[in-house]
């Protein structure tokens, strides 16, 4: 299914050394607190059956879930990185607010739902894992949306 042209982020969003560094530092600190190394949230299976040109829309869904269900509830943790990274990711989410897919997105929602279910099943450790994968989220958003 074709995607609207609104599924785009300017390259400059990912070329800011300071916030990029802070995002990766946050991910590193959270990953040190993640004791479940067998499970991966952002990996090949997230993109199963999703064409490359649909992946920005998929990553928008993952970003929104991560913000609403993980980062906002955990916003008091991993300071000072969290207070800088969350607004940055929220701005990216806002810029993708008009990103929609034409036609059926069930295959995408199914993949995103599996990620959500994994995080929920793991409870707080799932939220920590999601924060620990913010580097992968950042890189996947960059790859998918620029």
């Amino acid at each position: 299914a074709p995607i609207s042209s609104h599924c785009r982020l300017d390259k400059s969003n990912f070329q800011q050394p300071y916030i990029t560094n802070r995002t990766f530092m946050l991910a590193k600190e959270a990953s040190l607190a993640d004791n479940n190394t067998d499970v991966r949230l952002i990996g090949e299976k997230l993109f199963h059956g999703v064409s490359m040109s649909e992946r920005c829309y998929l990553m928008k869904q993952v970003l929104n879930f991560t913000l609403e269900e993980v980062l906002f509830p955990q916003s008091d943790r991993f300071q000072p990185y969290m207070q800088e990274v969350v607004p940055f990711l929220a701005r990216l989410s806002n810029r993708l607010s008009t990103c929609h897919i034409e036609g059926d997105d069930l295959h995408i929602q199914r993949n995103v739902q599996k990620l959500k279910d994994t995080v929920k099943k793991l409870g707080e450790s799932g939220e920590i894992k999601a924060i620990g994968e913010l580097d992968l989220l950042f890189m996947s958003l960059r790859n998918a949306c620029i």
């Epitope: 074709p2 952002i42 990996g43 090949e44 299976k45 993109f47 199963h48 064409s51 490359m52 040109s53 992968l136 890189m139 996947s140 790859n143 998918a144």
Partner: antibody, heavy 120, light 107 residues
């Protein structure tokens, strides 16, 4: 260093099953996908199918009914089995590794290929 | 399936020449096109993916451009080791499909 090496019989009789093995080193099969591609003599490349890092598979629908791709992670091997072969399956068969988890349909590292001839 | 059409099928050029190979997809693939180099007795080599991203270790004389359905591979100044066959591949969706190849020969 990432390496892939295809192996298998160079000659297969019509109607029999073609069996090939791709032995990999320098990476883990649980972290990267491995694809199979073939090339008919003097022709272009044709994607056959893929072994995902979690053990799932994706096949080209042109082969689905007679194709099986499997793996043995303890041996670092991915196998291809193509049944009911005909002369049209005569080709060089390649295995190739994906670039990374995101660019999983980009074939970054290839084996040198193994030639299979279908003939009685 | 998406059909990939390369042109020309063969091209003769000299060392130092600028060479352009084109690839056309039968439907839009956004920017998701890869280019590979094939030489006899050697493993195929990824040159470019996502239309214009140079694979690590590939010389900067190779460049890719295009989006939608029309793409080009350019070699800015041919070197002796560049004489080979080049294939495009759409990596947007399954099944992955390739062009029929362009053979780059010494003039």
């Amino acid at each position: 260093e990432v390496q892939l090496q295809e192996s298998g019989p160079g000659l297969v009789k019509p109607s029999q099953t073609l069996s090939l093995t791709c032995t990999v080193s320098g990476f883990s099969l649980t972290s990267y996908s491995v694809h199979w591609v073939r090339q008919h003599p003097g022709k272009g490349l044709e994607w056959i199918g893929r072994m995902w890092s979690d053990g799932d598979t994706s096949y080209n629908t042109a082969f689905t009914s007679r194709l099986t791709i499997s793996r043995d992670t303890s041996k670092n091997q991915v196998s291809l089995k193509l049944s009911s072969v005909t002369a049209a399956d005569t080709a060089v068969y390649y295995c190739a590794r994906s670039l990374d988890f995101y660019y999983d349909t980009t074939l970054a590292f290839w084996g040198q290929g193994t030639t299979v001839t279908v003939s009685s | 399936d998406i059909q990939m059409t390369q042109s020309p099928s063969s091209v003769s050029a000299s060392v130092g020449d600028r060479v352009t190979i084109t690839c056309k997809a039968s439907k839009t693939i956004s920017k998701y096109l890869a280019w590979y180099q094939q030489k006899p007795g050697k493993a195929n080599k990824l040159l470019i993916y996502s239309g214009s991203t140079l694979q690590s270790g590939v010389p900067s004389r190779f460049s890719g451009s295009g989006s939608g359905t029309d793409f080009t591979l350019t070699i800015s100044s041919l070197q002796p080791e560049d004489f080979a066959t080049y294939y495009c591949q759409q990596h947007n969706e399954y099944p992955l499909t390739f062009g029929q190849g362009t053979k780059l020969e010494i003039k």
